[in-house]
């Protein structure tokens, strides 16, 4: 017998979030991004795993690939050739780093309903893609690039020098993948598939990080990755272009590096095709405050690529590094020479500029004390972009359309008033010529994806509204969230506070600060999330706060570049300042304040705990950086310069966690790291632990064997359970 549920009040039927809810992903949401294949058609994988083609204009849909075919090769992904004759099916997915993975690929011929036999693709393949027109294939196998005119043809081998951990063709090495390109590929088809551009990375001289992978064997394996830490030898990059119709005519032709870039260490940062015979390359000095955009043209007579100095555009920062997190990429207009690009205006806000001849003569398209964030599409008459202008909330994203066909250009916010309470953070996905687009709203309400007419902006249909999630949340006591700002010494500190469901300002609550705080990051965003901190507020009665301090993004260069060459100072100060302000609000129990963070956040939380303020009772650092000398060159030097005596060695030394070992004596510290972290190496935590032991400071630690920077799978459950116990103990909350 069970007592019947009391229905006398809504409160009684509602329950708090449980840790199990979070770990099971009970309240996860879905988004819908159409896989556009034309102006009015898209592909989507249906709930029963058929690949369905939708035509918006006729309203018709049909299955182009059945779930049976997908299942026959255990396919987890697919790609339709632009001529719609073939589909590649991807299976045996094997993750490598953040973006990279290998897989087995099968080619399915839609015309005869059979898999292509003969000249099958080798396995495993590191990257594969169709040409933008027709059904040519480019793929990378064992660090070399191959080309197929058609799926059934024998391959043409473009590069021959590929070697594991030495020479990478068409795919990035570790540091370019993680810190520069943010892709698994480093090859780019020209718009009609005439040419294929690719990068070659030579890692021969890069020092190698080695760590043990314990596995199940008698002896652990050693993982070796060429990984340039700050100040170390970097990869040598070269860009080549090959004619895919006549690949053996003159072979791959190297694209020249601008002289002002080639004079010292440099990076390649991105490649953008303009036409089949015009390409735009972006380069960056190793000291990342000078970027050069170079437009190159194909010389038919010499079969070479010519990059005249008159088509070099320099972008330089005098107050920090070039760009935001990355240097922005250009979006070319229909004249195939002028382009739109986001960079800092004279007031130090990132805005859209139109460049026709020189950067000096750039026409500013957007302006104000807010930032343009992404240019989605430029058509003959419109430019679509996102910004955080609306109502002056930096943590929002709305989509705008600027008419560029008329003068003066008029601006319209496409999303600002659509679902104002529910939706304040959007991204968009456009079909060819922006005939239609999908809007994906991430919150603060339950996410929703909708389809719109590109000319009228009219909503055509809802693609995904997360009804099941909405229903599941009906009897859940979710925490309350508020986004506000603190004004401190001419600095605006935006914060998000997550409050227990029955929050009462007259009571005292334990406070947990969740911090990331890395350069050009943003934690205070108007997005929906039901996650661990939601549970801590809902069930355990904690107040959780996220604060965007100096170094964070989308609020102008003054805030962003404040941390330049001084990582580990202002980010920490601003978290501490915010905590003091929160205490002043009167509902925080100042004896029960904790801080936690992951990665850069682990670094900041460690430094905050070791700040000697006495504010924090305890804290957690997951996979923290502990010294900038241990982290990747491309990322670290962007913000810190070089660890040399004549540059910034002093601050590299001053900003370590180890240097503050003594200060951990009066806090409870939980240090957590995966032993197979390819990104922030276990070395970082090993050094913290060693310094704490040497200082005879007690602390708690947890390692996750063979886990990388993401601590995924069963480790995730263990991690959050462990951290929950730690915090509850710290806050004297009963289990």
């Amino acid at each position: 017998l069970r007592p019947s549920r009391v229905h006398n009040s809504e409160e009684n039927t509602m329950r708090a979030l449980t840790l199990k809810d979070i770990l099971n992903g009970t309240f996860s949401y879905k988004t819908f991004f159409p896989n556009w294949i034309s102006g009015q058609e898209y592909l989507h994988q249906s709930a029963d795993n058929n690949i369905v083609l939708y035509n918006i204009e006729t309203g018709q849909s049909y299955t182009i690939l059945s779930n049976r075919t997908m299942k026959s090769v255990n396919a987890s992904n697919y790609g339709l050739s632009p001529d719609r004759q073939f589909v590649y099916l991807e299976s045996d997915y094997s993750k490598l780093w953040r973006y990279s993975y290998t897989a087995t690929y099968y080619i399915y011929d839609l015309s005869n309903g059979e898999f292509v036999r003969g000249n099958e693709l080798p396995r495993p393949i590191q990257y594969l893609c169709w040409s933008p027109v027709g059904s040519k294939l480019a793929y990378v196998y064992q660090n070399n690039i191959y080309l197929k005119q058609r799926p059934g043809d024998p391959p043409f081998q473009i590069t021959f020098n590929g070697r594991e951990n030495k020479i990478f063709n068409g795919i990035p090495d570790w540091v370019y993948e993680e810190e520069m390109l943010a892709t698994k590929y480093a090859l780019w088809w020209s718009p009609n598939g005439k040419f294929l551009a690719y990068a070659e990375f030579n890692d021969t001289d890069i020092p190698v990080i080695a760590y043990s992978y314990y596995g199940d064997e008698q002896y652990p394996r050693t993982i070796n990755i060429p990984y340039p830490k700050a100040g170390a030898k970097n990869p040598v990059v070269r860009i080549f272009i090959i004619d895919t119709t006549y690949p053996a005519y003159v072979g791959p032709q190297e694209v020249p590096v601008p002289a002002m870039i080639a004079s010292s260490d440099y990076y390649f940062s991105w490649l953008t095709w303009v036409t089949d015979e015009r390409v735009c390359l972006q380069w960056l000095k190793r000291v990342q405050n000078v970027s050069v955009l170079s437009i190159c043209d194909f010389r038919e007579d010499w079969q070479t690529w010519d990059c005249p100095k008159t088509q070099e555009h320099i972008e330089e920062s005098r107050t920090g590094w070039a760009g935001g997190f990355f240097v922005s990429t250009p979006v070319f207009s229909y004249d195939a020479i002028s382009y739109y690009k986001i960079f800092s205006d004279k007031d130090g806000y990132k805005h859209i500029h139109y460049i026709k001849d020189t950067v000096e003569n750039a026409i500013q398209i957007t302006s104000g004390k807010w930032e343009a964030i992404n240019i989605f599409r430029v058509t003959q008459d419109s430019l679509f972009y996102s910004s955080n202008e609306f109502e002056e909330y930096p943590g929002r994203r709305n989509i705008y359309r600027i008419s560029i066909g008329s003068y003066p250009p008029s601006k319209k916010c496409v999303t600002c008033h659509l679902r104002k309470e529910r939706c304040q953070y959007y991204t968009a996905s456009f079909s060819d010529y922006a005939k239609y687009y999908a809007l994906v709203c991430y919150g603060p309400g339950i996410p929703i994806s909708t389809l719109h007419d590109g000319r009228t902006d009219q909503e055509i249909k809802i693609l995904e509204e997360n009804k099941e999630l909405e229903n599941a949340l009906k009897n859940i006591q979710l925490p309350k969230e508020e986004i506000k700002k603190l004004e401190v010494d001419e600095i605006t500190l935006w914060y998000k506070m997550i409050l227990p469901p029955q929050f009462d300002r007259s009571k005292k609550y334990p406070l947990l600060i969740q911090v990331y705080g890395g350069p050009c990051s943003q934690s205070v965003r108007s997005v929906f999330a039901v996650n661990w901190i939601s549970y801590l507020a809902s069930k355990e009665g904690m107040v959780i706060a996220l604060v965007d301090g100096r170094g964070t993004a989308f609020q102008g260069d003054k805030l962003l570049y404040a941390v330049y060459r001084k990582l580990g100072v202002y980010e920490v100060e601003d978290q501490i300042t915010a905590v003091r302000k929160f205490i002043e609000m009167g509902f925080i129990d100042e004896k029960r304040i904790a801080i936690w963070g992951w990665s850069y956040g682990g670094y900041v939380s460690s430094l905050a705990l070791a700040s000697g303020t006495g504010l924090f009772k305890c804290g957690i650092a997951v996979a923290p950086v502990s010294s900038w000398e241990y982290y990747a060159s491309v990322y670290t030097e962007r913000f810190m310069g070089l660890p040399t005596k004549d540059d910034n060695l002093e601050h590299y030394k001053n900003s370590t966690v180890m240097a503050r070992a003594e200060y951990f004596r009066n806090v409870d510290y939980l240090l957590i790291h995966g032993t197979a972290d390819d990104n922030v190496h276990f070395q970082n935590s090993a050094q913290i632990a060693k310094a704490l032991v040497n200082a005879q400071v007690d602390f708690q630690a947890m390692w996750y064997s063979d886990q990388n920077h993401g601590l995924s799978g069963l480790s995730t459950n263990h991690l959050y359970t462990h951290m929950t116990h730690f915090l509850k103990q710290c806050f004297s909350l009963s289990d």
Epitope: G134, Q149, F156, Y246
Partner: antibody
Framework: EVQLVESGGGLVQPGGSLRLSCAAS????????MSWVRQAPGKGLEWVSW????????GYADSVKGRFTISRDNSKNTLYLQMNSLRAEDTAVYYC???????????WGQGTLVTVSS | DIQMTQSPSSLSASVGDRVTITCRAS??????LNWYQQKPGKAPKLLIY???SLQSGVPSRFSGSGSGTDFTLTISSLQPEDFATYYC?????????FGQGTKVEIK
Amino acid sequence: EVQLVESGGGLVQPGGSLRLSCAASGFTFRGYIMSWVRQAPGKGLEWVSWISPEGSRTGYADSVKGRFTISRDNSKNTLYLQMNSLRAEDTAVYYCARLQYGTWFDYWGQGTLVTVSS
Amino acid sequence: DIQMTQSPSSLSASVGDRVTITCRASQSISSYLNWYQQKPGKAPKLLIYAASSLQSGVPSRFSGSGSGTDFTLTISSLQPEDFATYYCQQGTLLLPTFGQGTKVEIK
């Protein structure tokens, strides 16, 4: 299955003209470089000419430059070789071949004999 | 034009023999070297492309090697149907040229 069938060969007097045809099937003709290769009686192979997939670019051996013209009709899946000012040394079996990646000849026709003699 | 020189111009061998034919280019051609087999009255047939890749349907006793200027075609164990003329061909600069051929005869 890929098939290339040449036609149009025969006996022609020096200075005369001849047009060879090659009918292609079993593959997407418009996507490939096509070529003519010849073989004089008892001799080795000699490349004659190639044409790009869309037909806008061509290449010729020095021995035939200015006299021979290669062309194609992608709607008919047919390759042509217009041979003018023929000489005795042009006597050969003419093969139509698919020139994969502009590099190797992966499929060949059975050949058509052209004899230039008075 | 790039000249291709094959050696030997002819050879006699028995069934089961290992046969090697070499081809030298007058300048470097990377790996753009192909091998063909031709029987009397028939069209040539592609055996090896890109120096070492076996064309689909060609027996595995045929193999190719080399890069730059020096290349080799090897028949690991000669079969009766392998008696024919073999040609090498370079495929660079869109100006294909053939070697003069190597005739493999029954000893």
